[in-house]
């Protein structure tokens, strides 16, 4: 009785279960009752990631430098090339099809998490006692200067964008 379903890593053709080609290979010819499935390794620059019956392997992805992309991981016969973005840029999606410039945190905001090749800069408002007076993709909020530890007094209060201004204590005459 011809099979209607096949085991894992097999496929049904001409009422027969044939072995799929393993990752890194492509199909040359289906099995028969006398010969197994014939597979060949993918050519250089190509890959197949799954057990398959494809007659062609897939081309490795090209990481286009003009789009800010560079190779993160070279492709193999079994896996595609993985792209990431150049320094200062990050991917717009998980597949990293294109790159955009890292966001900078404006004055009054500090960097909570520095951008990676796949995620943008995460900014946070500087809380009371902290400030940031620059637009930066790296700088965190800095704590206000402690005037007391310098035997000085606060002459001008700090804000989320400016540090406190310290000055000498008034001397009693």
């Amino acid at each position: 009785e011809p099979p209607t379903a096949c085991r894992e890593k097999q496929y049904l053709i001409n009422s027969q279960c044939c072995s799929l080609c393993q990752p890194g290979q492509k199909l040359v010819s289906d099995c028969t009752e006398f010969t197994e499935t014939e597979c060949l390794p993918c050519d250089s620059g190509e890959f197949s990631a799954q057990w398959n019956r494809e007659i062609r392997c897939h081309q490795h992805r090209h990481c286009e430098p003009n789009q800010g992309l560079r190779v993160k991981k070279e492709g193999t016969a079994e896996s595609d090339t993985v792209c990431t973005c150049e320094e200062g840029w990050h991917c717009t999606s998980e597949a990293c099809e294109s790159c955009v410039l890292h966001r900078s945190c404006s004055p009054g905001f500090g960097v909570k998490q520095i951008a990676t090749g796949v995620s943008d800069t995460i900014c946070e408002p500087c809380p009371v006692g902290f400030f940031s007076n620059v637009s930066s993709a790296f700088e965190k909020c800095h704590p206000w200067t402690s005037c007391e530890t310098k035997d000085l007094v606060v002459q001008q209060a700090g804000t989320n964008k400016t540090d406190v201004v310290c000055g000498p204590q008034d001397r009693l005459r």
Epitope: E1, N14, S15, S29, E33, F34, T35, E36, E38
Partner: antibody
Framework: EVQLLESGGGLVQPGGSLRLSCAAS????????MSWVRQAPGKGLEWVSG????????SYADSVKGRFTISRDNSKNTLYLQMNSLRAEDTAVYYC??????????WGQGTLVTVSS | DIQMTQSPSSLSASVGDHVTITCRAS??????LNWYQQKPGKAPKLLIY???SLQSGVPSRFSGSGSGTDFTLTISSLQPEDFATYYC?????????FGQGTKLEIK
């Protein structure tokens, strides 16, 4: 017990024809692919032809393609090999064999075909 | 067609010897290889299938190994009934093809 019995061999002139038969018993014939393998005197084994259990698939060695035809009659549990345009190099003992998952697990005793003038 | 080359073509050995016969394919055939034994005037007999699986009823002194292009049939301790001709046969690509055979003779 599985048994395969070939018949139909003999002496034939070059260009002549011959039909070999293989009577099968001891198993469900229609469930198995079958093949013919030959062996020239003092030489090695050569796969000649094969046929699927339902007769839907046939395959031939290049050396016999277009001259030999494999067939089967599942109602008679019999395998055939029709050999036309015979040549001296077809002289051999012809074995029929049962296929099971890509290997030939049972063989007949063989029948001798001699092509000579 | 895939060419199968056996070595040696002939081999002399004694009862009790450890014997190895090799078979090389002209291209990779994964583990798609069978071994057969043939005695004079008799039909071939299946010994090993899928490179290393022992056919039912075959003594355990016979073993097969290998994958890709290089395969081995090993007889661990030769018995008098083992003197015969051995053939490898590939089924990785149509048509199936046999090696030229290795004749194992008594020394």
């Amino acid at each position: 017990e599985v048994q395969l019995l070939e018949s139909g061999g003999g002496l034939v002139q070059p260009g002549g024809s011959l039909r070999l038969s293989c009577a099968a018993s001891g198993f469900t014939f229609s469930s198995y692919a079958m093949s013919w393998v030959r062996q020239a005197p003092g030489k090695g084994l050569e796969w000649v032809s094969g046929i699927g259990g339902s007769s839907s698939y046939t395959s031939y060695a290049d050396s016999v393609k277009g001259r030999f035809t494999i067939s089967r009659d599942n109602s008679k549990n019999t395998l055939y090999l029709q050999m036309n345009s015979l040549r001296a190099e077809d002289t051999a003992v012809y074995y029929c064999a049962r296929y099971y998952s890509y290997h030939m697990d049972y063989w007949g005793q063989g029948t001798l075909v001699t092509v000579s003038s | 067609d895939i060419q199968m080359t056996q070595s040696p073509s002939s081999l002399s050995a004694s009862v009790g010897d450890h014997v190895t016969i090799t078979c090389r394919a002209s291209q990779s055939i994964s583990s798609y290889l069978n071994w057969y034994q043939q005695k004079p005037g008799k039909a071939p007999k299946l010994l090993i299938y899928a490179a290393s699986s022992l056919q039912s009823g075959v003594p355990s002194r016979f073993s097969g190994s290998g994958s890709g292009t290089d395969f081995t049939l090993t007889i661990s301790s030769l018995q008098p009934e083992d003197f015969a001709t051995y053939y490898c046969q590939q089924y990785g690509s149509a048509p199936p093809t046999f090696g030229q055979g290795t004749k194992l003779e008594i020394k």
